[in-house]
Amino acid sequence: GVFNYETETTSVIPAARLFKAFILDGDNLFPKVAPQAISSVENIEGNGGPGTIKKISFPEGLPFKYVKDRVDEVDHTNFKYNYAVIEGGPIGDTLEKISNEIKIVATPDGGSILKISNKYHTKGDHEVKAEQVKASKEMGETLLRAVESYLLAHSDAYNEQKLISEEDLGGEQKLISEEDLHHHHHH
């Protein structure tokens, strides 16, 4: 059967910046900001687009050592990311796969809402363990908050980059963030 679980969580980080860090660069960020949750992410095949296969390894002590994810959709315009967990742990035994959809929506206060859908495709009459749903949610929260903390501590990271001309700067050409751009023009 298919069991669908939907959750929403909020972040103080703007949608575009969060999508760039949490979704597009999670492979690099997760082991760095949450080593207790994820030890490494390895690209098995593909370039990040649909069809890409990633191996996510977990630290020593966790009962299951890795999962493999397949990227199904990356929508840069609407900040949407669909992927499926296709291997590891109970996948292949009680579960066929877990299909996940993440959509990051901007909020008026400058933050964002993450709308998350997890579809558990079970084999035969197997049901989804409540503990599985809880663990998935906790892992997602752990990663999100770790990335959020990193972004709050590194205000210049994962911001939109604008190329400012030499005339504007009165000197050499360089990349600066949108915040810097605003600051520059107000002067």
């Epitope: 009962p63 590891g88 109970p90 035994d93 877990i98 599985q132 663990a135 906790e138």
Partner: antibody
């Protein structure tokens, strides 16, 4: 059906060796750690050893460290426990069990267990 | 190592009774606590995992609760097949996993 079957137990003299086997079926064997638990008849349960799904990590109770060796052959869905320098206090029923869990969790439990194999060390 | 202490060590009860077995950990183990049932000559069988989750196929008269250091296993209405020995086990600090000493449930 998920199943574990132990074999290899028997009556041996102190100081000798014995190899127990645990054959698994009904699940993706290499995804799961396998644990050995022992029980002196009429007494409680004592954890003995654990091996990771790949076989790369092994763990032992202090009481058997340096004497017992755990290994696995994932092509045969089998875990082995080589018990050397056996002592009278190693006499027990030995169970193998799958370390079960859910994805992304640190929590784990033992399910299922094999039927057990009796090891008696006596002169 | 984390010590697990069960109480009582044994108890007598009648069919239809409500029975509670407690398990205390020597330090906080969050919800990393499992319960097993063992009948004479048989292997232990998982009843409850993660303190309160009922294992598939286990009758709903069994329930688990607790968090931190204190946990309980409750059988709401004892059936003849429930007379057995029950063990708690922590998986918070592993290795080693540790078990309680067991609670033997006998017919009154």
């Amino acid at each position: 059906e998920v199943q574990l079957v132990e074999s290899g137990g028997g009556l041996v003299q102190p100081g000798v060796s014995l190899r127990l086997s645990c054959v698994a079926s009904g699940f993706t064997f290499s995804n799961y750690d396998i644990t050995w638990i022992r029980q002196i008849p009429g007494k409680g349960l004592e954890w003995v050893s654990r091996i990771s799904g790949s076989g790369g990590s092994t763990y032992f109770a202090d009481s058997v460290k340096g004497r017992f060796i755990i290994s696995r052959d994932n092509s045969k869905n089998t875990v082995y426990m080589q018990m050397n320098s056996l002592r009278a206090e190693d006499s027990a029923v030995y169970y193998c069990a799958r370390r079960d869990s859910v994805l992304f969790s640190m929590n784990s439990w033992l399910d299922p267990w094999g039927q057990g194999t009796l090891v008696t060390v006596s002169s | 190592d984390i010590q697990m202490t069960q109480s009582p060590s044994s108890l007598s009860a009648s069919v239809g009774d409500r029975v509670t077995i407690t398990c205390r950990a020597s330090q906080s183990i969050s919800s990393y606590l499992n319960w097993y049932q063992q009948k004479p000559g048989k292997a232990p069988k998982l009843l409850i995992y993660a303190a309160s989750s009922l294992q598939s196929g286990v009758p709903s008269r069994f329930s688990g609760s607790g968090s931190g250091t204190d946990f309980t296993l409750t059988i709401s209405s004892l059936q003849p097949e429930d007379f057995a020995t029950y063990y708690c086990q922590q998986s918070y600090s592993t290795p080693p996993i540790t078990f309680g000493q067991g609670t033997r449930l006998e017919i009154k």
